[in-house]
Interface confidence: medium
């Protein structure tokens, strides 16, 4: 079955720049299928823009200005790229790639969509680092004692743009756990969001990960925030500044017993 | 030009109570097109639900039913037993793929219908209230309450900032909520909740334990992609309640 991944959840540009949005096709050879691009402007219907067929034929929707959009595909990386030239305010939208996928039963095709990339246009000069800054909250003693469950909370602050995806996994599992989240909130020129995960008592001794996808993550990779097991033996050490350094550096945690 | 028009912009549904979405076609006979339904959830994910010819997306066949009312020129999608997972925006779309002649393989979409899911009407349930802290940050966790109306107060004399609470449906079909704030005196912050004309305090749920019973991080930025800034504890930390732990991440 065909699967579409749009690695950029957002793409932030200043006016008149060029945006390149990527769509990675798996499960089907890209040179043996047609890839379609759709746009959803705020408050408008989702609209077909352009497609590139397996033989390289490009078809644009009538009424789309010529030279605005360019579509191509790179078989080596199984990627289709939508290029938007000379971006302007009216290009603010979420852009989806899509393809028709055959089902086992003959006559059945469905159009599957990628997760979308939101094009954001800004005139602001932002701080150098507008990636999400994480703070973790571990379960309160009261909750674990009284309810035989514990809630982890992952707070992300000072990020821009507002497009962010958060999910949770146990350390050695790829299964996405059922979590809950608040709305993304504006704080001055940046945004904050939090997500929480409640796990049964038997899972409290496992390490959990809050995984964050954001356009401005360092090196463009998902940020993994580690929640240590809470039933753990603790080694006494000299206090140090509570900073995290490089990804493979030792991280010092200051621990306290809270009674609430 | 052809247009697909949803019957409603917003449809509130109750968990377990069947709901019907309708989408009418203007300017053409619906029988000349194939109708598709999609759901867009938080984070913009567009998931295929149904296409004419009895095609359902993975996991949708048991709980959804697509239909066409030729006489009324409209498409119908029934959600047989809604759950909180069914919240999102629902889109009808059409194509003429395989209707003879040249294919129109593009989809023409209608505007979305926002489906909001509410718990079933049920006996009132008092919340449990817990406080979680990290440095100046305090979170008040309010669990398993019904009905939805609630006021959450983080009690402090030294507030830096507070955020609107997030109220969501819990997996058991009640409500959960979290309110976050930043306080200079986070150690002394408690949470009180007004619900159903009663007040519930986080202190009602405190467990009397000795200080070694349950150790947990005070404040950390524990991440595989560390940020450039450092959070230093602003609160006064009593050393008899502190351990230091070294973790390699």
């Amino acid at each position: 079955a065909g699967h579409l991944e749009q690695p950029q959840i957002s793409s932030t540009k200043t006016l008149s720049k060029t945006a390149r949005l990527e769509c990675v096709v798996s499960g089907i050879t890209i040179s043996a299928t047609s890839v379609y691009w759709y746009r959803e402007r705020p408050g408008e219907v989702i609209q077909f823009l352009v497609s590139i067929s397996y033989d390289g034929t490009v078809r644009k929707e009538s009424g789309i200005p010529s030279g605005k959009f360019e579509v191509d595909r790179i078989p080596e990386t199984s990627t289709s790229t939508l290029t938007i030239h000379n971006v302007e305010k009216q290009d603010i939208a979420t852009y989806y790639c899509a393809l028709w996928e055959a089902q086992q039963e003959l006559g059945k095709k469905i159009k599957v969509f990628g997760p979308g990339t939101k094009l954001i246009i800004t005139d602001k000069q932002l701080d150098a680092d507008v990636s999400p800054k994480p703070t973790i909250f571990l379960p309160s003693i009261a909750e674990t004692k009284l309810q035989k469950a514990g809630t982890y909370l992952c707070l992300l602050e000072k990020f821009f743009p507002d497009v962010i995806k958060i999910h949770w996994q146990e350390k050695k599992s790829n299964t996405i756990l059922g979590s809950q989240e608040g709305n993304t909130m504006k704080t001055n020129d940046t945004y904050m969001k939090f997500s929480w995960l409640t796990v049964p008592e038997k899972s409290l001794d496992k390490e959990h990960r809050c995984i964050v996808r954001h356009e401005n993550n360092k090196n463009g990779v998902d940020q993994e925030i580690i929640f240590p097991p809470i039933k753990t033996d603790v080694i006494t050490m000299d206090p140090k500044d509570n900073c995290s350094k490089d990804a493979n550096d030792t991280l010092l945690l200051q621990l306290t017993n809270t009674s609430a | 030009a052809i247009e697909l028009v949803p019957e409603h912009q917003t449809v509130p549904v109750s968990i377990g109570v069947p709901a019907t979405l309708r989408c009418s076609m203007k300017g053409e006979a619906i029988g000349n097109y194939y109708i598709n339904w999609y759901r867009k959830t938080q984070g913009n994910t567009m998931t295929f639900i149904y296409r004419e010819k009895d095609i359902y997306g993975p996991g949708f066949k048991d709980n959804f039913q697509g239909d066409i009312d030729i006489a009324k020129n409209l498409a119908v999608l029934k959600i047989l037993a809604p759950s909180e997972r069914d919240e999102g925006s629902y889109y009808c779309a059409c194509d003429t793929l395989g209707m003879g002649g040249e294919y129109t393989d593009k989809l023409i979409f209608g505007k979305g219908t926002r489906v909001t899911v509410e718990p079933r009407s049920q006996p009132h349930t008092k919340p449990s209230v817990f406080v979680m802290k990290n440095g100046t940050n305090v979170a008040c966790l309010v669990k398993e309450f019904y009905p939805k109306d609630i006021r959450i107060n983080l009690v402090s004399s030294k507030k830096i900032t507070e955020f609107d609470p997030a109220i969501v449906i819990s997996p058991s079909g009640k409500y959960n909520a979290v309110k976050l704030g930043k306080y200079e005196d986070s150690n002394s912050v408690t949470c009180s909740v007004q619900h159903d004309n009663k007040t519930v305090h986080s202190t009602d749920f405190e467990v009397k334990t000795d200080s070694t019973d349950h150790v947990k991080p005070k404040e950390t930025e524990n991440t595989k992609q560390p940020s450039k800034s450092c959070h230093k504890p602003k609160a006064i930390v009593h050393t008899e309640k502190v351990n230091m732990m070294s973790l390699t991440v």
Partner: antibody, heavy 124, light 112 residues
């Protein structure tokens, strides 16, 4: 009415590949599925796979997966079937066929128009 | 894969007499769209096959009305009401409900 004309007979060595073409005329090549079948001497018909040129995504029978490649060139209204790693048991007449027009888009499937067949002999 | 089983393997018939060929599928050929995608093909000696019947009982254009198809679900029959000399050949049933398309092993019809 669509007509299908296939390329001529081929003699191939074991381990090599063969590419058979099938040119359509007189109809809408893009919209109909092209199937490839084969028939070994004195044996029955076997479906190898097919393609709807409009989409270009081929469907293969599991037995041939990895050895067969079916493609289509809309500009010349020609479909191709390439079979690699040939062995003597691949000696057969290879047919292209199309399900033009009685039913729905994906039904290969009221296969009603056939090429004349291409004899492929695999021999050392 | 859906397995198609035909019987008999061979059917010698007198000219002008009826002939009947049976085809059984290993699972129902009823598609979720309500149609049953069972076809019958005829292959005369030295020629490519040709379509006779589609969707159980629909004769393809130009096919004489002495050919008829019937059946449902998993059991299907092709009948020739009066066999003529030009009907000599091998007859195949084929399912087009699911990938991969599969065919029966063939039934040879010849004149006694």
């Amino acid at each position: 009415q669509v007509q299908l004309v296939q390329s001529g007979a081929e003699v191939k060595k074991p381990g090599s590949s063969v590419k058979v073409s099938c040119k359509a005329s007189g109809g809408s090549f893009s919209n109909y599925a092209i199937s490839w079948m084969r028939q070994a001497p004195g044996q029955g018909l076997e479906w190898m796979g097919g393609i709807i040129p409009f989409f270009g995504t081929p469907d293969y029978a599991q037995k041939f997966q990895g050895r067969v490649t079916i493609t289509a060139d809309k500009s010349t209204s020609t479909a191709y079937m390439e079979l690699s790693s040939l062995r003597s048991e691949d000696t057969a007449v290879y047919y292209c066929s199309t399900g033009g027009g009685y039913g729905d888009y994906d039904y290969y499937y009221g296969i009603n128009v056939w090429g004349q067949g291409t004899m492929v002999t695999v021999s050392s | 894969d859906i397995v198609m089983t035909q019987s008999p393997l061979s059917s010698p018939v007198d000219l002008g007499q009826p002939a009947s060929i049976s085809c059984r599928s290993s699972q129902s050929l009823v598609h979720s769209d309500g149609n049953t995608y069972l076809s019958w093909l005829q292959q005369r000696p030295g020629q490519p096959p040709r379509l006779l019947i589609y969707k159980i009982s629909n004769r393809f254009s130009g096919v004489p009305d002495r050919f008829s198809g019937s059946g449902a679900g998993t059991d299907f029959t092709l009948k020739i009401s009066r066999v003529e000399a030009e009907d000599v050949g091998v007859y195949y049933c084929m399912q087009a409900k699911e990938f991969p398309l599969t065919l029966g092993g063939g039934t040879k019809v010849d004149i006694k």
